[in-house]
Structure formats: C-alpha cells, structure tokens
C-alpha cells in the first residue's frame, strides 16, 4: 500500500491518520474566514488574503510557502462611469435602464468594493440597434437562426441566456455571426429550481441577481499579453490589438427582471421550438427588433470597463518528499472570487486549507510523504485561469520533468446530491478504490461506502455497476497542467441531481448572493459534503504522493481509447460516400489502439511482477507511468489552438467547459458538409487521423520494455 520511509507512523495508518485529522468544523471555520469580504483578483483584499494563507500554511508546518507574483491583464468596470443597457425611443431618450448593481444580501449592505455585475474584458462601446434573441448562443443555435430561419444577426445586438456552454463561446459565436453587442442574462428556466425560494430564503437566484464572468477565448494562453511565457518583471507584452482572446464587441450581463423588460417587447419570428423558450412570461420571439407598437425603439449598451495590467499573487506551499523529492504531486485551487466566493472558490479553498493542516500535523509528528507535495492558492482564475497558467509557464521545464499529478480544488460543492469526478483514465482505479474506502455522507446510505452511493445516484452511461467519471474539459486551473503539459489530472466535488435539476451550474453562481450563509443554511449545514470532498481530494493526493508504485492504471486508458476511436469512426461514417471518395481510413488509428491495449496489458503484468525493492527498477516503472500522460502531448498543439496539446482530450471548440475526445479529428469532421472545399476538408480529417494514430502508437511504445 503506502510507503513507510522517514516516518514513525505505521504504513497502514498513514492514510487513516491523514483522513481522521480532517474535520468538518475546521472547514466551516475557514470558509467563514475566507468569505467576509470580496477577494477580487488584483485587489488589496486578495493580496492580504494571500499573505494570510502564506502565514497559516507556514504555521501548519509546510517546509516553505512563497508568493509568486505576475503582472497580467485584468478588467474592471469604471467606478465613475457605470455599465448599463437601455431601451431608447426614436428620439434617443432612455425609457428603460437596467440596474447598476445587485441589491446586497442581508447583513452585507455596508460592505464596500462589491464589483457590480460586468463581463470581464468587454471592450468599451455604446452600440445601439435591434435585438435578436439567440437562445443559449451555442453553435447549433446560430445554425438554427442563420440556416433554417434565415435570420441575419449582422449589425444586431443579440441577447442570449446563460447556461449549457461557457459564456466566452457564446460571445465568440455572436461575433462570428456579425453581432455588434451581446447581452447575457440568467433565465429562471436555467437558474431557478422549481419549489425552492430565492435568496435569502432559499438557494435560487432572485430577479436582481446577475452572473459575472470573463468572456475570453484564450484557448489555454494564460495572460492575453504574454502567451506561452510568464508575465514577469522583464516580460515583453503584446499590444492590446494583438492580445489573445479578447472580445471585439461590447458584452454585459443582466438578471431576469431586467431581461423581462427587454424580451417582453420582442417581435419578428416566433421561437423555432419549445427548446428556445425559458420560464419568463414573454413570447421568446427571436426578432429582429421589437413588436409593432415598439418597433421604433432600440436597445443601447453603455460599456465603459477598462483593461489594466495588474499584479496578482499565487501562494505556493511545499512539503518535501522523503524519498523522491523531485517528483511533484500538486493540489491547487483558486483564491480570487467575483464577490464573496461562498461557493466559488472558497468552499474549495477552505478544503485545501484543511488538507494542508492535516498534512502539516502528520509532518510535525515526524512523517513525510514519499514524493513532494505542492499546494497552490491560485490568483485570477476568474479572469482566465491566469495565476495557474503563468506559474506553470514559469515552471514548465520542472513540471514536465517532475510532475506526477495535479488535483484541482475549486468549489467543493455545486449541489449536495452526489459525488462528481472528472479525471484522466489513469486515475479511474485510484478514485474507485479510494471511494470504496470512504463513508458516504448521503442520507439513506448510512454505513455504506461513498462508491456505493455515487454509483447508485450517478451510474456510468456505458458501464453498468460503475459510477460516471467524466472527461476533463476546461474552465478551471487544471487546464495548463493537463491540456498543455500532459500531467495526469483530476477534480472532484459534490454536485446536484442532473436528472431532476436541469438548471446550469448552481443558481447563485458568480452573484453577490454566493455567501457563507448560502452554504451554511442551504447547501451543507453540517459541512459533511465538504468533509467528504476533502477526503476524496486529500486521499487522492495522499496516495499519489505516498504509494510506492504510482496508483495509475494504463489499462483503463486502453479501454477509453477503444471507446473514443469507435465514437469518432461512427461520426465519420455519417459520410460514407466522402469516406470512399477521399480514401479516408481509420485503420491506422484502430491498429494503434490495439497495439496500445496489448502493450498496456503486458506493462501491467510486469508491474505486478517486478522487484519493488530495487529502487532503480521501481523508479523506471514509475517514470513510465508518470510520462504516459505526457506522451499524449503533441508539441505542435491542435490546429489554431497551440496551447491545447493533448491529442486525446481538449476542451470542446463549442464549449470550453466540456471535454472532447480525439479533438483534432472531431473538429476536422465538424460541419464538414458545409465546407467550401471538401477535398481540403477531408484531407485535414486524414491528417488528424494520422496525428492521432501516431500519438497513440508513440504513447504505447513508452510502455514497452525499455530494452
């Protein structure tokens, strides 16, 4: 099981001692402490919190705790010139204005520095024009509008409801459709669960609540002005015109009270089907423009936000490994919040804090992990994963040589129904084995394992009797580690029942109402779900840092590679004639997957049989496991997305939050029937099959006997 080097605690008690030390009441106390004032990235308050965490991690017993600062592009509203949207009449008079701030929650009326709702990195502008309702502004929504309904968004202001996909993808789609502005709003259909009261009486979004968020399309670049390199003291910065991922049209978010005022007047085309209707008492007409009586009225946006290079601070704590100090297991989560961060991120940061405290307690008793554990409190995640990405860029050479695993620790909860895990297939067995050893916190599962309740409530769609484990996408700080550097990564949190609650995320996400009281009153009064998440995240880190043989199973990669190859082949076979015409063959990919399966199984056999007392052979086998994820990295990256380099997984081009398998082939096939040059398009499909097949085969060979 676990190593016993440099410790006075018996091996079988190591993990138990660590888990037993985790306390729900501590997590509760830390959450309260982290949520009393806003901690917006780039502000003095967040710098002070960084120093507090640094100090406390030192007290907890870490070997060293340092601040790592970077000067990155951030975005803020203009304090004297607020952002808003108005309806104007034919004379240009503003007859309706959206609210300038969210009504503060009870007890927080006198808190200063609450940033008003805004879309971070929106350019300045005051466009006016007719409104077009574009549903969720997904790729398929614009296809429906442009191709089926023949509605042209060019020169229009579009209004889109939040949900389903990352907001940056919505803005990108609107830009491509020719829109000159975007209004984002939260529809009760997506952010108001039936039968639950709105905050402060329940966990639903009130009509004045608004979701903040960045609208970048960074594709893994980090700081928009220093892609690929750290934003340090001597950085060369691009001009703003060359910055990566910035939107080109003004964008602003509103709540559903204000959205009602805009949508109730909509005219033009009726919604194409019921999937375009939300829950407001409006017709959900698509437009363009307002109906008869109001047809001369227009919508005008007033956006005055500014982009500013600002200093951010990561906190990096180190617990040196006793046996393999040059092998790093990283636990990281962000610290910056939009306002109070009751869930995002502080429910995660509080859990990390307690995990650090528990590890520190063991260290003070004479124990050390086998491998080095790095703890990170990232800054500016909300502005595009900037803190984690800049740090990884600065330390990329160390990380690619020494990085064993990265465990993410953002929000611990997005519900209180069951566990949710996204991770590399290498960690499937680790997660299964760990959750079988942990107690379920769920009602009705007393005395049962977490694995049991998780499997019952969230069964795998493909493999019966197993829990669902999802692909890693993006939208969080694991991105640079997994998608760019190829370090095995995973994340875990407690989630809602997706079957019965079809709203997107949790209703109060990124609003002023995401408070300590939201968690303590409505989500997890006993903090038992937080504790369970601490046990899962901490347990994973413990095993990854302490087990003699790394707890990675390459056979599970073989299983998913077969599944993904089958899936992408099936997509391609929707075009049998073109497959024939352009001689498109998947034989090379299927052959590579079979070879991977064969070699992975032989490696697993050797892993069971080798002499674990031989440190050289042990290190050699562990290195093959550690570097397997790295072997799926293509140094050239994906087409037009150089920082997404993992050939098996990438964030979906249509939704940053979602993971796509064989993304190069998938994107080459996407909407291929509409391409103007089919020969070129199918040539790209063939090239992507070649890249995928080569990469899988090359990865397989890293598992072969070394000589």
């Amino acid at each position: 099981k676990s190593s016993n080097e440099a410790t006075n605690i018996t091996p079988k008690h190591n993990m138990k001692a660590f888990l037993d030390e985790l306390k729900a009441e501590n997590i509760k106390k830390f959450l309260y402490n982290f949520t009393q004032i806003p901690h917006l990235a780039g502000t003095e308050q967040n710098f002070q919190l960084a120093k507090q965490i640094q100090s406390q991690w030192k007290e907890f017993g870490l070997d060293s705790v340092e601040l790592a600062h970077y000067d990155v592009l951030l975005s803020y509203p203009n304090k004297t010139h607020p952002n808003y949207i108005s309806i104007i009449n034919e004379d240009g008079n503003e007859i309706f204005n959206t609210s300038l701030f969210e009504p503060p929650p009870p007890g927080y009326e006198n808190v200063s520095d609450i940033v008003p709702p805004f879309s971070a990195f929106s350019p300045q502008g005051m466009p006016e024009g007719d409104l077009v309702y574009v549903n969720y502004a997904r790729t398929e929504d614009f296809f429906k509008l442009e191709r089926d309904m023949k509605i042209n968004c060019s020169g229009k202001i579009v209004i889109a409801r939040y949900g389903k996909v990352f907001r940056g993808n919505k803005v990108k789609n609107a830009q491509l459709a020719g829109a000159k502005g975007v209004i984002l709003y939260s529809d009760p259909a997506d952010y108001f669960a039936p039968g639950v009261k709105s905050y402060p009486d329940g966990w639903n979004l009130p009509g004045g609540g608004v979701q903040r968020g960045n609208i970048l399309n960074l594709n893994g670049a980090g700081d928009p002005l220093t892609p690929g390199y750290p934003a340090n003291e001597y950085a060369y910065r691009r001009g703003i015109a060359e910055a990566v991922g910035l939107p080109s049209i003004p964008v602003h978010p509103i709540g559903y009270y204000d959205a009602q005022k805009l949508l109730e007047k909509m005219g033009g085309s009726a919604p194409p089907d019921s999937s375009w209707r939300g829950s407001l008492k409006v017709p959900y007409n698509v437009g363009p423009g307002f109906t008869g009586n109001f047809s001369t009225q227009k919508v005008k946006m007033h956006i005055h936000s500014t982009n500013e290079v600002t200093r951010i601070y990561n906190v990096i704590g180190t617990l040196r490994g006793a046996v393999e100090p040059d092998r790093y297991v990283i636990l990281g989560g962000h610290r910056d919040s939009w306002v109070f961060g009751g869930i995002d991120p502080q429910s995660g940061a509080a859990v990390v804090h307690e995990i650090v405290r528990s590890f520190g307690t063991l260290k003070k008793e004479g124990w050390r992990p086998r491998r080095t554990i790095l703890f990170a409190s990232w800054d500016a995640e909300e502005f595009g994963l900037l803190g984690s990405t800049e740090w990884a860029e600065e330390n990329s050479r160390l990380l690619q040589e020494r990085g064993v695993a990265y465990i993410n620790a953002d929000s611990s909860i997005e519900g209180n129904y069951t566990l949710r895990v996204d991770c590399t297939p290498l960690m499937y067995s680790l997660v299964h084995n760990l959750t079988k050893e942990l107690k379920s916190p769920d009602e009705g599962f007393e005395g049962k394992s977490l694995y049991e309740s998780w499997t019952k409530k969230s069964p795998s769609p493909e493999f019966s009797g197993m829990p669902r484990i999802s692909k890693l996408g993006s939208g969080n700080d694991f991105e640079v580690f997994f998608q760019r550097l190829g370090i095995a990564s995973g994340r875990a949190r407690y989630t809602k029942n997706w079957e019965t609650n079809k709203f997107s995320g949790y209703p109060l996400y990124h609003s002023v109402y995401e408070t300590y009281e939201l968690v303590e009153k409505f989500y997890d009064p006993m903090f038992k779900y937080h504790l369970t998440v601490a046990q899962v995240r901490g347990g994973m880190v413990f095993e990854l840092a302490n087990s003699i043989v790394l707890p990675f199973d390459c056979r599970d990669y073989a299983v998913v590679l077969r599944k993904y190859a089958d899936k992408i082949y099936s997509i391609s076979m929707k075009h049998p004639q073109e497959m024939k015409t352009y001689s498109v063959s998947f034989d090379s990919l299927f052959s590579a997957v079979k070879n991977f399966t064969e070699i992975a199984s032989k490696f697993s056999e050797r892993l069971q049989d080798f002499d674990k007392s031989n440190p050289i052979v042990l290190r050699m086998m562990n290195d093959q496991l550690m570097f397997l994820e790295r072997a799926f990295i293509d140094p050239l990256g994906l087409p037009d997305r150089p920082f997404y380099r993992h050939v098996i997984y990438a964030p979906s081009s249509h939704n940053k939050y979602a993971g796509e398998s064989f993304p190069g082939i998938y994107d080459a096939l996407f909407d291929i029937e509409s391409k103007v040059d089919p020969s070129k398009a199918w040539g790209e499909v063939k090239r992507q099959i070649y890249v995928a097949a080569f990469t899988v085969q090359a990865a397989a060979e890293t598992l072969s006997e070394v000589a």
Partner: antibody, heavy 121, light 110 residues
Framework: EVQLVESGGGLVQPGGSLRLSCAAS????????MSWVRQAPGKGLEWVSA????????YYADSVKGRFTISRDNSKNTLWLQMNSLRAEDTAVYYC??????????????WGQGTLVTVSS | QSVLTQPPSVSAAPGQKVTISCSGS????????VSWYQQLPGTAPKLLIY???KRPSGIPDRFSGSKSGTSATLGITGLQTGDEADYYC???????????FGGGTKLTVL
Amino acid sequence: EVQLVESGGGLVQPGGSLRLSCAASGFTFSSYAMSWVRQAPGKGLEWVSAISGGIGSTYYADSVKGRFTISRDNSKNTLWLQMNSLRAEDTAVYYCAKDAVGATPYYFDYWGQGTLVTVSS
Amino acid sequence: QSVLTQPPSVSAAPGQKVTISCSGSSSNIGINYVSWYQQLPGTAPKLLIYDNNKRPSGIPDRFSGSKSGTSATLGITGLQTGDEADYYCGTWDSSLSAVVFGGGTKLTVL
C-alpha cells in the same frame, strides 16, 4: 498453462437466477478482458458479456442487458456471471473466454470447457 | 439473426481447398480485426486465425485468413477429415460496443 474452469450451471425455472463462475489460472488475470460466450443446443456462438482489465468496465449483448451482470475478482482470479430473470431462450452452454490482446475484447485465445444452463419449468 | 453472415455449410473432398466467407458492415469487419474459430464436435471453440490473417502457434499453415472491405474469408487447403467442424468468424462492432459472431459454417469433408 492457461486454464479456465466454469461452474455453476444447472437447471433453473423461468424467472429464476443462477450465478456462473470461471476460475482462471496460468496468466495475469487482471490484465485481460474476459468474456462469456454461449451456445444454445444445435446453434451458433453468441457473445453474452465482457469485462475489461483495469477497473472492470462492462459490456453486454442487447439480449441480456439489465438481466445479467458480469463481474470479476482479480485477487481470486475469478470471473462471474450473475443471471437473473432467466428465460427459456437463455438455455445454452456458457463458455468463459480470455481475450488475447489485453484490457478490452478483441479475440479469444483460450476458452473453458463450458457449463450447461437449462431454463425450463 | 447474426450480425455477421456466413454460409451455413460448405463441403469438399480430402486434399481439396475450401473457402468460408464472412460478411459484415463498416462498423464491424470494415474497421475491426477479424478472428476465426474452429469448433470440433463436442468441444469448446479454438482460435484459428486472429488479426484477419495471423495464425496462433500450433495452427498449420493450411489455414489462412484474409479481409477485404466489409468481408473476410477463411481458406483451408489440403483438407483432412479432422477438419470437419463448425467454423465461426468474430469481430468487434464499433457501433454496438459488442463482440459479434457469424452464424457458423459446418464444414463437411466428403
């Protein structure tokens, strides 16, 4: 030498249950996908179910989905097939088969001798 | 009804050559590897051909396999009376996520 020995077959009434076992030896059991394949009297081979190496991802033929459950215990080198809601058409010799390639089913290089399951009232 | 189609029976005299066809679709034979099994009367099946055309050790070179498009073929030359058996083709089906077999072909050596 690779050996697969099935047991647990017998006569059962329609709607009843039966659990088949397959004891494996002579290879690293956990590294290979294992399958159950059946053959009704006088008929051809029909693949029933498979379980991967690693965490044990499962696959089923449509004809048995929701009624049969495949499982394995790598520490005991044993494969199981739990058969519930049995029907007359499930009557067959059930073979345990080892995959030749690895963690997912490709082709079977070793087969057991089979165990007969008869579903009849 | 089997996903893969084989002729129910074939026959030939000793010393002759015989071929058994196996027809499928793009989602099975079209993209995946084909294997062939021999089942002598009263015994368990035995692997005869794998990866379309490879023979496990101990299988004589009288047995051969080939694949073209969505069809596969098993060839047996120099027929012997001991070759009388049922022969099955098998492969993975990428759409069904399942192993599929042909209905079997009974070989009679006259």
